[in-house]
């Protein structure tokens, strides 16, 4: 039979490191994490660490019982967790039957957004007491909230991740500028700004019509030249406060009639939360 | 049955380069390290290096990292072997030889002569 | 690189004498060591593996033992077939390493 993993949590020190081994398994070849989605129970999805790894091929591998799996996670707080994962049989062959080096995963490390994981392994048993023995590390960096699969977990949705604002803005003089967007029954509270190296324009806008989504129009007085600028609209939505994804647009010159003209190249960007 | 077919005996001059192949049967290819070690005349036997056909991952003997190249065409489940810059003293049997398990050889190629001499 | 000496370099024995050849490494290598036979203008062939485990159709008066860095070949009564050169190597991680021969000749 070939070998297989049986993984199980392990925070403490391996009980092997107490022990004097003559010799230690050699080291991994390969250790590599990304990220996979599972749906949970309550309509909304998880992502998950996969991480994989590959053993060096070498009578070395008959030594190894288990490989252990220790992740740091750094954001707002720190975490860290490790997993040990034994092998089920003893190796008879040094790369697998079929071809190729052994390979192993382990899917079950949660993964929050916009987190720095350190992920590191060793073969067990390791290396003594106060000597260094044979590990690999990786970091592995989550997404936010504009990424393709994050943006529709739940806590993204609420930060605006699937809302289009389709923001126009036109110059309607020297010293206005006129912005339309769409809003979201998310929030009712925006901030538009005018940009041009510095700000040079701004406005709050209070959409009372939450529950709809709505045309909003706002004017917003200028203090330089506004062609060409960016304008950045702000949502404040309850889940994220004033780190909400922030939509982008350019500022033209308004048609004769004072119809905004409409943008295709409208692009979205975090804000410092990115959930 | 597990065979390893090597190719005819060369003679080469000082300088040159010589290429030894190794065609397989008898099992999956992919699935055993492929090593090649030589013996000069009257001499012991020599590790060269190995390579996984499955993915070419190559280890060589230090001795002659800088000289020999390892290659696999899966497509007709041969090796290759190619030491290049000979000398005199690269005259030896050159063989191929694999296992199932560990690196012990239990099936080895029939041996290249290569000679060399000006 | 693990070192690999065998001994004695060349022996002279009759058809049913008891032979050994002592192979010692310089470091432990777990038993992770073979012994092969080879005849002039052949390839060698597998002995046993592992120490101690015989090679497909190896006959049973070949054994080996030995464990850490010293290991030892066998041939419980020598015949006519058996005479020729052996090797021991250790398979213990590249670069694997043959121990130096032993040349085994009629007496």
């Known amino acids: 039979r070939e070998p297989t993993v049986q993984c199980g949590s392990e925070t403490g020190p391996s009980p092997e490191w107490m022990l004097q081994h003559d010799l230690i398994p050699g080291d991994l070849r390969d250790l590599r994490v990304e990220p996979v989605t599972t749906s949970v129970a309550t309509g909304d999805y998880s992502i998950l660490m996969n991480v994989s790894w590959v053993l060096r091929a070498d009578a070395s591998i008959r030594l190894l019982k288990a490989t252990k799996i220790c992740v740091t996670g750094k954001s707002n707080f720190q975490s860290y967790s490790c997993v040990r994962c034994n092998y089920t049989e003893a190796f008879q062959t040094q790369t697998r039957p079929s071809g190729g080096k052994w390979t192993f995963s382990y899917i079950g490390f949660p993964v929050e957004l916009n987190t720095v994981y350190f992920i590191g392994a060793h073969n067990i048993p390791n290396a003594n007491m106060n000597e260094d023995g044979p590990s690999m590390s990786v970091n592995f960096t989550s997404p936010g909230c504009l990424d393709h699969i994050m943006k529709y977990k739940k806590k993204c949705v609420k930060a605006g991740s699937l809302w289009d604002p389709n923001i126009t803005a036109c110059k309607k003089n020297e010293e206005t500028v006129e912005v339309n967007f769409t809003t979201t029954p998310l929030g009712n509270r925006y901030m538009a700004l005018i940009q041009h190296s510095t700000i040079i324009g701004f406005s709050q806008v209070f959409e009372p019509h939450q529950k709809k989504q709505t045309r909003a129009s706002v004017v917003i007085p200028v203090t330089g030249d506004s062609e060409g600028a960016t304008v950045q609209l702000t949502p404040y939505f309850p889940t994220c406060g004033s780190d909400c994804i922030r939509h982008k647009g350019t500022v033209v010159l308004c048609p004769q009639t004072g119809v905004p003209f409409p943008l295709d190249n409208n692009k979205s960007k975090p804000g410092g939360w990115l959930p | 049955e597990v065979q390893l077919v090597q190719s005819g005996a060369e003679v080469k001059k000082p300088g040159a380069s010589v290429k030894v192949s190794c065609k397989t049967s008898?099992?999956?290819?992919?699935?055993?390290?492929m090593n090649w070690v030589r013996q000069a005349p009257g001499q012991g036997l020599e590790w060269m290096g190995r390579?996984?056909?499955?993915?070419?991952?190559?280890q060589y003997n230090q001795k002659f990292k800088d000289r020999v190249t390892l290659t696999v065409d899966t497509s007709i489940s041969t090796a290759y072997m190619e030491l290049s810059r000979l000398r005199s003293d690269d005259t030896a049997v050159y063989y191929c030889?694999?296992?199932?398990?560990?690196?012990?050889?239990?099936?080895w190629g029939q041996g290249t002569l290569v000679t060399v001499s000006s | 690189d693990i070192q690999m000496t065998q001994s004695p370099s060349s022996l002279s024995a009759s058809v049913g004498d008891r032979v050994t050849i002592t192979c010692r490494t310089s470091?432990?290598?777990?038993?992770?060591l073979a012994w092969y036979q080879q005849k002039p203008g052949k390839a060698p062939k597998l002995l046993l593996y592992?120490?101690?485990n015989l090679g497909d159709g190896v006959p049973s008066r070949f054994s080996g033992s030995g464990s850490g860095t010293d290991y030892t070949l066998t041939i419980s009564s020598l015949q006519p077939e058996d005479f020729a050169t052996y090797y021991c190597q250790h398979f213990w991680g590249p670069p694997y390493t043959f121990g130096g021969g032993t040349k085994v000749e009629i007496k």
């Open positions: 592992d120490a101690t």
């Open positions: 390579i996984d056909p499955y993915d070419s991952e190559i």
């Open positions: 470091e432990n290598i777990y038993s992770n």
């Open positions: 008898g099992y999956t290819f992919i699935s055993y390290w």
């Open positions: 030889a694999t296992s199932g398990g560990f690196d012990w050889f239990a099936y």
